[in-house]
């Protein structure tokens, strides 16, 4: 089963695929589809790359915002929609018989939740959860794997501040997480 | 218009080797997987193998693997498919077909070369 | 191995009337399931691609539908010309296979 990332309607996301090059430098062919991966290539592809540069995105809002030149092929799809929710693919076609590296990943888009305006929590997830929220900005250089995530705005109401905070502490403490 | 336009076929004895060509044109061949495909006399069509656009990596069929090779030439829009160690099973009509772009279908089709392999 | 099942064998019908040809998948292959047609002594063309996607050019006659395992090729109302052997081919799993093709034959 897929690895599952959110994201807001309207916000980035960012789903993480990664390789790497043997020796350093030495880039293969990657192609990121709408879709699990097929026996072959990328179903409705998104965007792909040759082995110099990316050479093919089907709309602007598709992005590999990482270290491509070093094997961070994660995907960026900018001002995400409700629509660009589902499957995706990312496959790294390593060369030689039958090599290729196929990673199925799940976006789902939600609606941003009505809250008044409020302090923003800041939390650093270093561990793995099974549901991976995800935004535009991430702030890591090195690879991103499930395991690891990007900075998470939370926003939370006045009025439940204090106890989302306690509880959130709790649940962080329990995950070994930190919070700041 | 796409064109796939097979050749190299004929008559070879069990053992013996065979290369067959694929000329392409109509489209970017150098972005395009091509695949071999055949089909023996009076039956249904068996994958064979496969090669990206770029001819790095390959993909076979287990009933061909250590005993086919497909490569290709983007310079001249050539696809080819080196046969050795062949066995009276390989008798078939052998298409190159060009997939579709997205890796789960094939749109255009060559229209075959025959491959007899008997002593 | 992914087995597609093809039924029926052979169908034996008249010009004009409906054909419902059936693929079934020995486990899920998603969307990713095309069907071909291939007239005696001819290449196959490609008629539904991702299991309900016509091909260019392809009379609107010709309908794909299904998922998972279970396919179907329908032909509204058949044409001379559309007496002949059919495929499915699945790519979703490792390796690629065809059914064993259905007839469609004149009554």
């Known amino acids: 089963s897929e690895v599952e990332y959110i994201a807001e309607v309207g916000q980035n996301a960012y789903l993480p695929c990664s390789y790497t090059p043997a020796p350093p430098g030495n880039l293969v062919p990657v192609c990121w589809g709408k879709g699990a991966c097929p026996v072959f290539d990328c179903s409705n592809v998104v965007l792909r790359t040759d082995n110099r540069d990316v050479n093919d995105r089907t709309s602007g809002r598709y992005w590999l915002k990482g270290d491509f030149h070093k094997g961070d092929v994660s995907l960026t799809i900018e001002n995400v929609t409700l629509a660009d929710s589902g499957v995706y693919c990312c496959r790294i076609q390593i060369p030689g018989i039958m090599n290729d590296e196929k990673h199925n990943v799940k976006l789902v888009v939600i609606k941003p939740a009505k809250v008044t305006p409020a302090p923003t929590l800041q939390r650093d997830l270093t561990s793995a959860f099974p549901r991976m929220l995800t935004t535009g900005e991430h702030g890591p250089a090195e690879t991103q794997t499930p395991g690891s995530l990007p900075d998470v705005n939370l926003t939370v109401s006045n009025f439940f501040c204090e106890l989302q905070i306690f509880t959130l502490t709790n649940e962080l403490r329990d995950s070994g997480a930190t919070i700041r | 218009e796409v064109q796939l336009l097979e050749s190299g076929g004929g008559l070879v004895q069990p053992g013996g080797s065979l290369r067959l060509s694929c000329a392409a044109s109509g489209f970017t061949f150098r972005t395009h997987l091509i695949s071999w495909v055949r089909q023996a006399p009076g039956k249904g069509l068996e994958w064979v193998a496969a090669?990206?656009?770029?001819?790095?990596?390959?993909y076979y069929a287990d009933s061909v693997k250590g005993r086919f090779i497909i490569s290709r030439d983007n310079s001249k829009n050539t696809l080819f498919l080196q046969m050795n160690s062949l066995r009276a099973e390989d008798t078939a009509v052998y298409y190159c077909?060009?997939?579709?772009?997205?890796?789960?279908?094939?749109?255009?089709w060559g229209q075959g070369t025959l491959v007899t392999v008997s002593s | 191995e992914t087995v597609l099942t093809q039924s029926p064998v052979t169908l034996s019908l008249s010009p004009g009337e409906r054909a419902t040809l059936s693929c079934r998948a020995s486990q899920s292959v998603g969307s990713y399931l095309a069907w071909y047609q291939q007239k005696p002594g001819q290449a196959p063309r490609l008629l539904i691609y991702d299991a309900s996607n016509r091909a260019t050019g392809i009379p609107a006659r010709f309908s794909g539908s299904g998922s998972g395992t279970d396919f179907t090729l329908t032909i509204s109302s058949l044409e001379p010309e559309d007496f002949a052997v059919y495929y499915c081919q699945q790519r979703s799993n490792w390796p690629p296979t065809f059914g064993q093709g259905t007839k469609v034959e004149i009554k």
């Open positions: 090669i990206t656009g770029s001819g790095g990596s390959t």
């Open positions: 077909a060009k997939d579709g772009g997205s890796g789960s279908y094939d749109d255009f």
